[in-house]
């Protein structure tokens, strides 16, 4: 019996087609992805093949103005239109709190939404009961397939699930649910979830009875043969893991942002064992037509976005200096504003010992592309912020050793004075440079704000300590020459859309007046 699994993950509100790098589509003839194009390909495959499941491994939420405006209603609407069969909860599905998940998505989705390792307690338990499930048994042709979900247990540090959801260890939570499916005579089981490729492989190895793992969170690109675009494969598709009980378990993921549609064909024997598996992600490039009816619907929903872009988010009573002349040479108040917003967006008081789990922010000055003039009645709009942060990036959470941070700050000024983008703006960090010293030895003082303290204060950076830092995904990926970050980071979790972070902060503060306050000094 053959099953075709079509899968997406980490779509991050890319409802419209995007450029090749998943930013805003500029030249339509070169654009990719989007739900209208995805629908065309899904329909084609459904038409051709008998037993097809369309699955999503989480993080539909967060990433473009679509989510900012529609807050998840767009996800439910267009996933319903594409007739998804199941979805796993990702960490970003909790970005607007549990209510922001329940109302727009859980109550509106016409497909099951799954996670076996999230347990509700207190008053939430009855409110959310039945709105998401640990597993679902789906009829496919003449057979049944069990889908069991899972979500990163780091979600409380990455999003806003509140205090009434407990995120358990994935493997511990999955095993009893898979066992239950086996007792229900379901012998074909897919684990669908959002914990990253390493955890996907562990689930394949450790959870008895799981036949296939469809994952997300780590934006992993797997491919067999010559890859069709810029993404470099982390391994073959599917990636085969030998389980502890000796089975060959295919593990798949389909990069991110709706650029590819994962396509996996599995052949099962009559006892539900995987006999063979093959496939590849399908690049959704512009040679695949956008479905006209879905496209028309997208255009209808778009109207509200255009109106939103020009509405006031808040006010500034000071000039927001985002000029290259400032942000690439010294501390600039636009850099301070953005870093303060980044920290504010990551406030998660999850432990009595810590006032917060993260206190530090770094931001490449070259990523700040425009100032905002306060003389326009102080008004700040989404449109203004899009000029400051035009690249459609995210502000991510990483874990780094102190020694890596020290290297990063040396790199920040290794060729100072040439208006290059690697000069770092900061939050929760005090740095002093001596430019008379040779490159690689210019950081004379580097103090960082404590987290394990009731009264935050600045202490000298410890080389061997592991620190959490918020930074642009551009830096996490080694951009602007920060190869040491990419090479030495110990953990990397994708965060929220950059403009969304700053706009939320400005809306919350209502009136802002960031200052230049001595975060960066030269001796």
């Amino acid at each position: 019996w053959e099953l075709t699994i079509l899968h997406t993950n980490d779509v991050h509100s890319r409802l419209e087609q995007t450029s090749e790098d998943s930013s805003k589509c500029v030249n339509a003839s070169r654009c990719m992805g989007g739900v209208a194009r995805l629908f065309t390909k899904v329909q084609q495959i459904r038409r051709a093949e008998p037993n097809v499941l369309l699955l999503d491994a989480g993080d539909q939420y967060q990433g473009t103005i679509w989510f900012t405006v529609y807050k998840g209603a767009e996800v439910a609407h267009f996933m319903n239109a594409l007739r998804y069969d199941a979805m796993a909860l990702g960490n970003h599905e909790f970005d607007n709190g549990v209510e922001g998940l329940i109302e727009p998505l859980l109550k509106e989705a016409k497909f099951p939404i799954l996670s076996a390792n999230i347990k509700a307690k207190g008053p939430l338990a009855s409110q959310i009961s039945g709105l998401y499930l640990p597993y679902k048994v789906l009829p496919v042709g003449d057979e049944v397939v069990g889908i069991v979900g899972y979500t990163s247990k780091e979600t409380p540090f990455l999003s806003n699930p509140g205090t009434n959801l407990v995120f358990e260890d994935e493997i511990t939570a999955l095993q009893p649910e898979v066992d239950k499916l086996k007792t229900l005579n379901v012998n074909k089981i897919i684990a669908l979830g959002h914990s990253g490729f390493e955890m996907d492989k562990l689930i394949a190895q450790k959870v008895r009875g799981v036949d296939v793992v469809v994952g997300g969170h780590s934006n992993t690109f797997l491919y067999t043969g010559n890859p069709p675009s810029k993404e470099v494969p982390a391994g073959k598709y599917p990636f085969i893991v030998t389980s502890d009980d000796g089975r060959k378990v295919p593990v798949v993921q389909a990069y991110a942002f709706g650029k590819y549609l994962g396509y996996l064909k599995i052949e099962f024997d009559e006892r539900g064992n995987v006999i063979s598996s093959h496939g590849n992600p399908i690049l959704l490039n512009s040679s695949i037509p956008e479905d006209p009816s879905i496209k028309a619907d997208i255009n209808k929903w778009r109207i509200k976005l255009d109106n939103y872009s020009t509405q006031e988010l808040g006010k500034t009573i000071v000039y927001l200096d985002g000029s290259s002349q400032s942000c690439r040479f010294r501390e600039c108040n636009m850099g301070n504003l953005i870093c303060d917003a980044m920290i504010n967006n990551n406030l998660r008081h999850t432990d009595e010992m810590f006032w917060n789990h993260v206190s530090m922010c770094i931001l490449n000055g070259g990523g700040i592309r425009s100032p905002i003039d306060e003389r326009n009645n102080g008004t700040i709009t989404w449109e203004n912020l899009a000029a400051v942060l035009p690249f459609g990036g995210t502000f991510d959470l990483v874990q780094l050793k102190g020694s890596t941070l020290k290297k990063a700050f040396e790199h920040s000024v290794h060729r100072y004075g040439q208006s290059t983008g690697e000069f770092l703006q900061v939050g929760g960090i005090h740095v002093v440079y001596d430019l008379s010293r040779k490159p690689g030895d210019r950081v004379v003082k580097l103090d960082v704000l404590c987290t394990k303290c009731r009264v935050p204060s600045y202490d000298p950076l410890k080389m061997d300590e592991v620190y959490k830092v918020i930074l642009p995904n551009f830096l996490a990926n080694g951009g602007d020459g920060f190869q040491m970050i990419k090479d030495e980071l110990l953990r990397h979790d994708s965060g929220d859309q950059d403009i969304n972070v700053v706009s939320t902060y400005i809306s919350k503060m209502k009136v802002i007046y960031p200052a230049v306050e001595g975060r960066i000094k030269f001796s």
Epitope: I45, R47, A48, Y263, S287, I288, P289, E290
Partner: antibody
Framework: QVQLVQSGAEVKKPGASVKVSCKAS????????LSWVRQATGQGLEWMGE????????YYNEKFKGRVTMTANTSISTAYMELSSLRSEDTAVYYC??????????????WGAGTTVTVSS | AIRMTQSPSSFSASTGDRVTITCKAS??????VAWYQQKPGKAPKLLIY???YRYSGVPSRFSGSGSGTDFTLTISCLQSEDFATYYC?????????FGGGTKLEIK
């Protein structure tokens, strides 16, 4: 290399049936769709229907529903098109053409050489 | 069924000429349009798929454009081997339909 080899010319009487074959080689037969297109002498092209050999799923042009049957034998990588209740206006060249539904070439990328079917009393 | 109206139905041109053939769909077909070349007694050959993508091995003088309902095939510098009949086809909805053809003849 990809090849679609069709069966030879047929002469049929009105009311009879004809079965045209299309043998595929050079690719995985079950991973592509096969369409049948006909062309009457001096006329344009007319799509009759398609079969997906991997699943056996068929889709027919309403115009031929009830008269056309498309099948595939995956063990010998051959597709068949049977047209019944033949009439003189069915006299045409019948082509099989491949369709890459997993790829991105929206069109028929390989065609058979055609089979001439003549319906005459 | 979606109607594909092709024009002109025939056209006389000389080698070296730039030739444009148009095709109009009776409803929005996105970019799901292909163009074929057919010579007498031969099967059609795919030239352009998805409205603007040149099929492998097709000379660069052939180009396609359009989306929605209006499509164009352009031959930038006509060669002697290009005299043939050209068909557009929509691949958006079944029944897949072809234009009536454009016969390109030597002037």
């Amino acid at each position: 290399q990809v090849q679609l080899v069709q069966s030879g010319a047929e002469v049929k009487k009105p009311g009879a049936s004809v079965k045209v074959s299309c043998k595929a080689s050079g690719y995985t037969f079950t991973s592509y769709g096969l369409s049948w297109v006909r062309q009457a002498t001096g006329q344009g092209l007319e799509w009759m229907g398609e079969i997906y050999p991997g699943s056996g799923n068929t889709y027919y042009n309403e115009k031929f529903k009830g008269r056309v049957t498309m099948t595939a034998n995956t063990s010998i990588s051959t597709a068949y098109m049977e047209l019944s209740s033949l009439r003189s206006e069915d006299t045409a060249v019948y082509y099989c053409a491949r369709y890459d539904y997993l790829g991105s070439s929206y069109g028929f990328d390989y065609w058979g050489a055609g089979t001439t079917v003549t319906v005459s009393s | 069924a979606i109607r594909m109206t092709q024009s002109p139905s025939s056209f006389s041109a000389s080698t070296g000429d730039r030739v444009t053939i148009t095709c109009k769909a009776s409803q929005d077909v996105s970019t799901a349009v292909a163009w074929y070349q057919q010579k007498p007694g031969k099967a059609p050959k795919l030239l352009i798929y998805s409205a603007s993508y040149r099929y492998s091995g097709v000379p660069s003088r052939f180009s396609g454009s359009g989306s929605g309902t209006d499509f164009t095939l352009t031959i930038s510098c006509l060669q002697s081997e290009d005299f043939a009949t050209y068909y557009c086809q929509q691949h958006y909805n079944t029944p897949y339909t072809f234009g009536g053809g454009t016969k390109l003849e030597i002037k």
